[in-house]
Amino acid sequence: CDLPQTHSLGSRRTLMLLAQMRRISLFSCLKDRHDFGFPQEEFGNQFQKAETIPVLHEMIQQIFNLFSTKDSSAAWDETLLDKFYTELYQQLNDLEACVIQGVGVTETPLMKEDSILAVRKYFQRITLYLKEKKYSPCAWEVVRAEIMRSFSLSTNLQESLRSKE
């Protein structure tokens, strides 16, 4: 399955929206910096496409989960957040279209269970950090910057998938 060109554009729009969502300078939040241990190895180029789609799906779904909480709604501009949801939703649709094309409805695609778990644990660490920091503006800014970085890395994987065709 070819992820459509629109998926690439959607990823870039998502990154742009994340950049626009910034409310305070990250430099004023240096004391709140944190290493969340993004599992970069799970997004390596060595995987087959059928193995990468579940990991990309998990990444996008978890970003959706993170930014669709009540605490998130209070932290960010509502209009930008709505646009952000729409972009993520469309990217999930693109991946779903690939899954439907590639497998029978009763079959399970090749699942990278460990990789999926690693992505979930990464987002659990982010959620715990926000909770510990009481969802402060600086904590959210650190998380926004982290998601920009990790989403950008996963987008690079999508690009490398397309170039492998």
Epitope: P54, Q62, S68, Y89, E96, V105, T108, M111, E113
Partner: antibody
Amino acid sequence: QVQLQESGPGLMKPSETLSLTCTVSGGSVSSGSYYWSWIRQPPGMGLEWIGYIYSGGGANYNPSLKSRVTISVDTSKNQFSLKLNSVTAADTAVYFCARGIPMVRGILHYWGQGTLVTVSS
Amino acid sequence: EIVLTQSPGTLSLSPGERATLSCRASQSVSSSFLAWYQQKPGQAPRLLIYGASSRATGIPDRFSGSGSGTDFTLTISRLEPEDFAVYYCQQYGSSPYTFGQGTKLEIK
């Protein structure tokens, strides 16, 4: 093959909170990339999607019910549940739980047999 | 939300005949994210078609789906006695996921 079984109260009074449970066998509610859904069907009527919960956390609800509904997972019992607040006669329906294929939110492939909930004073 | 309108409401045919069921969406259904279900009295719905035209595993090849955008069709090429039931279309391309009101296929 995954099997789903709904359980709940059967008869309720208006303004009460409906609690339904879907017990899953032949698969785990917390592993894989699955969306676990609730759907309802008023007697002699069509189907209405209530919402889903994702195996990795996060739920999505039908806006028409969003203010009253919560879907949650109990991994220790391998169950997922539906809570619907302030029920009225309009909530009388057969409630189904369902699951699709990995990573696809809307396809409903495996269904429970349904449980009838009647709201009456 | 996307409203799905099914027609006809009731279709009366005899075994061996061809059935054509229609589902029209109020707006375009993205990526042909449309499914068809069959429901018999007292039973849960059964998935027949997904992605507008892909048959679910175990579904006989007399069932076929077609269409894209806003117009979709379920065709049963040669009706068997067990095919008489209610048929629902469902879109799962945008939330909330919605169902048509159903078409009842009855024996003439």
